[in-house]
Interface confidence: medium
């Protein structure tokens, strides 16, 4: 009888663990969906506004291949930086390769020097995984150096030629990115 009760308890424990896991997956999926939605809205907005503009990038944006970059002149906390980029039909910078990282850091050296710039990278509170704003994981060579000892949410930023991490509530410049308009010629 005791063994039966013990088996039932173990089964229920296992069921509970599975439900918790499912809930965590659902929460991550919901977060990813919300971000994807924002990402798509920004892309649509970019496409529509670009249709009226013949140059690949708007004024004061820098072009590299298929991307346009905007280096902000204001400081914001990370979340507001993302909102500021979305208002411009863009998102916080997502660094896809070492080549892109080199272009960004080279451009920053020319523009402003050694300041801190938020990028679209944040650490998931539950799993501790680094995620770009579209829900994807950065490549191993593009993981922030562990610099933040913050108990608060941690986000990624670029300084000089490094990717670092900091409390998302600190104030930094930021970099927005959107697709360059393809020439219809």
């Amino acid at each position: 009888k005791l063994l039966q009760v013990s088996t039932i308890a173990m089964q229920q424990q296992e069921k509970l663990i599975q439900q918790e896991r499912a809930l965590l997956n659902f929460t991550e999926w919901k977060r990813s969906c919300a971000l994807q939605m924002k990402y798509c809205q920004a892309f649509m907005q970019n496409s529509l506004s670009s249709a009226h503009n013949s140059s690949p990038c708007p004024n004061n944006w820098i072009q590299n291949r298929e991307s346009c970059y905007y280096v902000s002149e204001i400081w914001s906390i990370w979340h507001t930086s993302q909102e500021n980029c979305l208002k411009e039909g863009s998102t916080l910078l997502q660094i896809e390769s070492k080549e892109e990282m080199d272009f960004i850091t080279g451009s920053l050296r020319k523009i402003k020097g050694s300041y801190d710039y938020w990028v679209g990278l944040s650490q998931d509170g539950h799993s501790g995984r680094w995620l770009w704003q579209d829900g994807s994981s950065p490549s191993p060579g593009l993981l922030p150096a562990e610099r933040s000892q913050s108990a608060n949410q941690v986000c990624g930023y670029v300084k000089s030629n490094s990717l670092l991490s900091s409390n998302c509530s600190t104030w930094k410049y930021f970099i927005c990115e959107k697709y360059a308009l393809r020439s219809s010629v």
Epitope: S72, E73, I74, W75, S76, T80, E83, N84, W171
Partner: nanobody
Amino acid sequence: QVQLQESGGGLVQPGGSLRLSCAASGFTFDDYAIGWFRQAPGKEHEGVSCISRSDGSTYYDDSVKGRFTISSDNAKNTVYLQMNSLKPEDTAVYYCAAEVPSTYSCSGFREDYKGKGTQVTVSS
């Protein structure tokens, strides 16, 4: 031309208080949010507090919540930062900055819209 002038810094013992002032000129005060920032030697600048002139909303960094209070006097075009229960880790140059005019809330500050700063040293 936006001009901001901080004052009120000084040397104070741990647990003591200081009141910083930020006098603004060259722009319509009501159209901006004003933020207080600080920078300790070798550290990045951090936002301490901010007050939005449009709706009076305030922002405080977790490290100063419950100890610092931001307020403003429209007639004098001045924003104040009352700092109580000061700690050695509050030691820094404190400066105020004006919000980018297009947003009117504590969302973004320009480097060229800030004052020269006032030194606050907390030490026994």
